[in-house]
């Protein structure tokens, strides 16, 4: 049988065959970080020969060669220094604007191993536009310097390099120019996960529920779909399966997107998936069509039975036939729900095409994309019913242009991208949607992503303190109140001097607010049993603060989602006419239901929540505590149906100072707070002033270690009382 | 779906102040995608632009008025104002409002008649 | 400033294919917009950025712009396209509308 021949190495480099030495085997060459290979592959042809892509001589030896970035081209009103040709990576220019022009975008920018600049384009402007100077990004020349209402600025790469992003721009009414920033790039280069995922998270989230369902004022900011409870999202993964696709990278592929699928259903926002496998020929695995595709179950298995040899017999890439199956399922969609319907005309489409390589057959997938704008009438009023992201994976055949051609283009978003392999593929979906990149007011909402921060990952946890040393933990329930425990409160001092520190993107301290007022519930007592031998008692142990200013959403400042109201029901995905006993049923369903809260150091700590039997059991170990309740007859007269319990097996306990913050438990990626600490039998910091130190209890310590939490399900009344104005509360 | 709707006197003295108002309804007139302006049209004539206010209440005006015009905002009721100094009979036209999103006149009011009587 | 040049009138014969063109220098490098005026009533925009057509629009309304010219296409004429048509383009943060067609279904 014919094959190639094996003397194919790259100096400095590696290489991989997807169908060993056979004809039609493609080999990829890869080199270290900061090169990059050329050729960057070869095809085994059934000559027994190797093929180079766009080469002139069959055979050139593979090399790995230095990764540079694009020089500035010019720069206007004012300098950049050095004046290279082009820049190693490691690499810095530096930019400085004339004499009344303001720097917006970054002084100095490196040059990075992927052969993208970091930071942002600098930009020398006076603000004399109606929009703003768009800049010139490096390795640009733009045409047109005027920047009012209707004018139009055009852009060319220089050299080899390539645009992404749009060519022309114009100057709209609201100051914004139309599409997306211009960058000219290597066509070698590609792109970091960590660019990427908050790049299509960003643009992605304003389709995930970005404005609050419930929010009482529907003003609009920026570019911010809004997905009301009637609204709908149509999204189509359509997944390359051709012959340079391996088998292994077809399966990150399917794992993927059943990420990607996964974190849309934990939204509040009623979702349709298609699923579209493609080589030569697409295959409809999952239609918007069928009910089954607003199942997670449903479509997460369609996609598990996605099978790599479904496209044995068809080999090549064929976009165009994978984009126009989305374009008939939309018009069979049309005619069956009516053109000119509210049912049809509010449904968003998002479309995400994976893809190793550029199409090679059935002709230009643009016509396709041209087909669906068509058909949704899509518009300036209604560029926000369709977003296409295109998305090339592996440095090889993936044709920029193209990519970028396919894309939307929306100012401040990016739709194409290049990936360098299916891991980086895999990272970008586990991070995209990590929306804690919302700006509103979406609540439970924390950054699951391995590399975020502690404050990032519980948005909600703030930290109350007097004057001097830091006191108690509460939680952000919406954007100027805090839910955190009355005991905080019990010297009664004035409220004036205390601080509430709420996290800030800008600060890895934070931000300190001043309460404007602190609801402490009148039930409240410490001493109100002392006759009875009960020493301290902690019934009703919950207090409200409202700040003195909103709280500015970001990353870092996000409410947590409570149980029974609106809010917290659309973020389960109940159904509409769900009651406050539902949400118990759903979040405490378990004799041991595992929770969370939230260390002195940030870091999220875990719980079980005892309920039913277990609760009893769990609460028993009250009466062997003989300091603070030495004549204790009745435990349930310390431990009421008003605390939840936890504390048994490997539970970690909270210390004094972690009192009031929430406890809470996750659901379908977003978090609920069932519960804030109260009391307990044991505080693991005693004697520590290191907030990372805690000491378990040791296994014979009589009482053995438990703690208390308020139960948010049983302070229905009081917190209705006061929360009436700010949730929207369910039914009981 | 944003309707506008101008108000204001039908008949103006030459050299006095001509003042419509325009209402919209269906949607805030602060929203940033949206821009706002005057266009007239003298009988049997084309359509001429008078000026633009934008959310950020910038303006621009059609040269031609030489400083006669003043467009304003006044969001508590939804509304935007045009107040056209020193007129003359050359001043009579059916004058629109219009709203845009993005670079074009997408939505009209259905014109009002202003006559300038000597 | 920036002048926009319309025929006065252009005619068509029913079903037939009517083009009205918009002058302008290096017009190609602005967008242009369309709006139809029917007798009595508000004008209505029917192609924006020289070849888009807003919802509502019927698929005979097409647009085109190249070097110094501006083409509003109206195929298969209707009695109801009878009325004036007019080009637009922003210059500056300034509008200008190009002076009218007049355009008669036969």
């Known amino acids: 049988a014919t094959s190639c021949p094996q003397n194919v190495n790259i100096s400095g480099g590696t290489f991989t065959l997807s169908h060993g030495w056979a004809p039609g085997s493609l080999l990829i060459y890869s080199c270290p970080q900061g090169l990059y290979p050329s050729p960057a592959s070869r095809l085994c042809k059934s000559s027994g020969q190797w093929q180079t892509p766009r080469a002139t001589r069959s055979l050139t030896k593979a090399v790995c060669k230095p990764v540079r970035c694009p020089a500035p081209v010019s720069f206007e009103n004012g300098i950049y220094t050095p004046r290279l040709g082009s820049y190693p990576v490691g690499g810095n220019v530096s930019f400085e604007c004339e004499d009344g022009f303001i720097l917006r975008g970054s002084p100095v920018r490196q040059c990075r191993p992927n052969g993208m600049w970091d930071g942002e384009t600098a930009v020398c402007d006076n603000g004399a536009g109606h929009c703003p100077n768009p800049g010139i990004s490096l390795g640009a020349v733009r045409t047109g310097s005027r920047f009012g209402h209707g004018d139009k600025v055009r852009y060319r790469c220089s050299s080899n390099l390539v645009l992404t992003g749009s060519a022309e721009r114009e100057c709209q009414g609201n100051g914004v120019w139309s599409g997306t920033e211009p960058i000219c790039r290597q066509p070698y280069s590609y792109d970091f996960p960590e660019d990427v995922a908050p790049a299509l998270g960003t643009s992605f989230s304003h389709m995930l529920g970005a404005t609050n369902p419930t929010q009482r004022t529907k003003e609009s900011l920026g570019r911010k779909i809004q997905i009301q409870r009637s609204g709908h999202l149509n999204l189509y993964l359509l997944l390359d399966s051709s012959q340079s696709v391996s088998e292994n990278d077809f399966l990150i592929f399917k794992e993927s997107a059943s990420l990607m699928v996964d974190r849309i259903f934990s939204f509040e926002i009623n979702v349709s998936v298609a699923i579209i496998t493609f080589a030569s020929e697409p295959k409809v695995l999952m239609s918007v069509l069928n009910v089954n595709s607003r199942d997670i179950t449903e479509v997460i298995s369609s996609l598990e039975n996605a099978k790599y040899k479904d496209h044995e017999n068809g080999t090549g890439t064929n976009t165009y036939a994978a984009l126009n199956s989305v374009y008939l399922m939309m018009n069979n969609q049309m005619q069956l729900l009516g053109m000119k319907t509210m049912a049809w005309q509010e449904i968003r489409h998002a479309i995400i095409l994976l893809t190793d390589g550029k199409s090679n057959m059935g002709g230009s997938p643009k016509t396709a994309v041209d087909q669906i704008r068509e058909i949704l009438n899509i518009n300036q009023k209604r560029n926000d019913y369709l977003d296409i992201y295109a998305i090339g994976v592996g440095k090889l055949d993936v044709d920029w242009r193209e990519l970028n051609e396919l894309g939307s283009k929306k100012d401040g978003e990016r739709h194409a991208f290049i990936l360098q392999d299916t891991k980086a593929l895999h990272q970008v979906f586990e991070h995209m949607l990590d929306v804690s990149k919302l700006t509103d007011t979406i609540c439970g909402v924390g950054n699951m992503s391995a590399n975020a921060s502690d404050q990032e990952r519980t948005p909600w946890h703030v930290t109350i303190k007097p004057k001097s040393q830091e006191t108690c933990r509460g939680a952000l329930i919406s954007d100027q109140w805090v839910l955190t425990a009355a005991h905080c409160f019990r010297d009664g001092n004035d409220h004036s001097l205390w601080r509430v520190n709420v996290g800030d993107p800008k600060s890895q301290w934070g931000k300190e607010f001043l309460i404007e007022k602190a609801v402490i519930s009148p039930g409240f007592d410490v001493f109100a049993k002392k006759n009875q031998g009960i020493l301290e008692f902690y019934g009703d142990d919950i207090a409200l603060l409202k700040l003195a200013q909103k709280v500015k959403m970001s990353t870092h400042a996000r409410p947590i989602c409570l149980p029974c109201t609106m809010e917290a029901n659309l973020a389960l995905r109940r159904p509409q006419g769900s009651t406050c006993r539902d949400h118990e049923n759903e979040l405490l369903n378990k004799q041991s239901v595992p929770a969370h809260f939230v260390a002195l150091n940030g870091s999220k700590l875990n719980i079980n929540l005892k309920m039913g039997v277990e609760w009893t059991s769990c609460a028993e170990v009250v009466s062997q505590e003989k300091t603070m309740f030495p004549n204790l007859t009745d435990v349930r007269e310390v431990v009421t149906d008003q605390f939840l319990c936890s504390g048994t097996q490997e539970d970690e306990s909270p210390c004094k100072g972690e009192s009031g913050g929430a406890v809470f438990l996750e659901r379908r990626f977003r978090f609920f707070q069932v519960g804030l600490v109260s009391w307990g039998l044991y505080n693991p910091c005693l004697g520590s002033a290191d907030k990372n130190s805690r000491k378990r209890a040791p296994r014979s310590k009589v009482p053995p270690p438990r703690d208390f939490h308020i139960n948010l399900f049983r302070m229905q009344p009081w917190l209705r009382q006061h929360l009436g104005d700010v949730l929207n509360f369910l039914p009981l | 779906q944003l309707q506008l709707q101008e108000s204001g006197p039908g008949l103006v003295k030459s050299s006095e102040t001509l003042s419509l108002t325009c209402t919209v309804s269906?949607?805030?007139?602060?929203?940033?995608?949206?821009?706002w302006g005057w266009i007239r049209q003298p009988p049997g004539k084309g359509l001429e632009w008078i000026g633009t206010?934008?959310?950020?209440?910038?303006?621009y005006y059609n040269p031609s008025l030489k400083s006669r015009g003043t467009i304003s905002v006044g969001t508590s009721k939804n509304q935007f104002s045009l107040k056209l100094s020193s007129v003359t009979a050359a001043d009579t036209a059916v004058f629109y409002c219009?709203?845009?999103?993005?670079?074009?006149?997408?939505?009209w009011g259905q014109g009002t008649l202003v006559t300038v009587s000597s | 400033s920036y002048d926009l040049s319309q025929p006065l009138s252009v005619s068509v014969a029913l079903g037939q294919t009517a083009r009205i063109t918009c002058g302008g220098n290096?017009?190609?490098?602005?967008?242009v917009h369309w709006y139809q005026q029917r007798p009595g009533q508000a004008p209505v925009l029917v192609i924006y950025r020289n070849s888009n057509r807003p919802s509502g629009i019927p698929e005979r309304f097409s647009g085109s712009n190249s070097g110094n010219t501006a083409t509003l296409t109206i195929s298969r004429g209707q009695g109801g396209d009878e009325a004036d048509y007019y080009c637009q383009v922003w210059d500056s943060s300034t509008v200008i509308f190009g002076g009218g067609t007049k355009l008669t279904v036969l």
């Open positions: 290096d017009i190609e490098s602005k967008n």
């Open positions: 219009a709203g845009g999103v993005g670079v074009t006149w997408d939505y």
């Open positions: 206010i934008y959310y950020s209440g910038r303006t």
């Open positions: 269906g949607g805030p007139i602060s929203s940033s995608s949206y821009y």
